[in-house]
Amino acid sequence: ASVATELRCQCLQTLQGIHPKNIQSVNVKSPGPHCAQTEVIATLKNGRKACLNPASPIVKKIIEKMLNSDKSN
């Protein structure tokens, strides 16, 4: 689940089994010149950043929930 910082794909691998309980925020990066794939980077309660698999049903659910809670705030 390493997160790189250069101008390229930031997610070198993704974490399996992520749980929404400790996710503070989610940043969804659309494909662009720096990276051809969608990247989902979660910031955890302890500040650590973790890459999630955008194709995972649970990750889609987490993103949807986060976006909805942002709208209602």
Epitope: H19, K21, N22, L44, N46, R48, I58
Partner: antibody, heavy 119, light 107 residues
């Protein structure tokens, strides 16, 4: 390596209180939830609650709310569980267990602390 | 609270054989189930989390499957060191809840 070292066995009187400890080493104590789990003699495992040492946030099982308090001391990397108004129902082995940050699986456990409530 | 019904409560199997333990949740737990091995006098040991992901160091003889409310845990090629009590745990919703446990004995 990650280690959770719990305090020794306790023999206590009914109606009294007990405070058991769980000293963590080998990881950033403040950054991970610490869980507490109860096992009565011959019975299964029962989740009590958890504390996040970084900010003191807690979650309790409804059954244990009011029975005790979870605290954490960041300076000594030690989590504590205090149990009050003890009865024979509280005689059990109590375990602390670290919860991983991303998937909340309890990956490291203490060896357990036996509490016996007897007059 | 989510109830976890684990069965059987005990089972006896032969060395080299296979055993399967099941846990049924009272509602959908989104694959958030872990399985623990517990031996007397020790702390429980995480074997599998998120239904099927093996903890590092756990042999591939152990496996888990399931979705929704129904989950199972299997051990094949049973070895003497597998003698223990096994518990499922749901961690989809607080409070986390354990199944009642399955005591595994060797015939």
């Amino acid at each position: 390596q990650v280690q959770l070292q719990q305090s020794g066995a306790e023999l206590v009187r009914p109606g009294s209180s007990v405070k058991i400890s769980c000293k963590a080493s080998g990881y950033a104590f403040s950054d991970y939830w610490m869980n507490w789990v109860k096992q009565r003699p011959g019975q299964g495992l029962e989740w009590i609650g958890q504390i996040y040492p970084g900010d003191g946030d807690t979650n309790y099982s409804g059954k244990f709310k009011g029975k005790g308090t979870l605290t954490a001391d960041k300076s000594s990397s030690t989590a504590y569980m205090q149990l009050n108004s003890l009865t024979s129902e509280d005689s059990a082995v109590y375990f602390c267990a670290r919860e991983r940050d991303y998937d909340v699986a309890m990956d490291y456990w203490g060896q357990g602390t036996s509490v016996t409530v007897s007059s | 609270d989510i109830q976890m019904t684990q069965s059987p409560s005990s089972l006896s199997a032969s060395l080299g054989g296979k055993v399967t333990i099941t846990c049924k949740a009272s509602q959908d737990i989104n694959k958030y189930i872990a399985w623990f091995q517990h031996k007397p006098g020790k702390g429980p040991r995480l074997v599998i989390h998120y239904t099927s992901i093996l903890q590092p160091g756990i042999p591939s003889r152990f496996s888990g499957v399931g979705s929704g409310r129904d989950y199972s845990f299997s051990i094949r090629n049973l070895e003497p060191e597998d003698i223990a009590t096994y518990y499922c745990l749901q961690y989809d919703n607080l409070p986390w809840t354990f199944g009642g446990g399955t005591k595994l004995e060797i015939k």
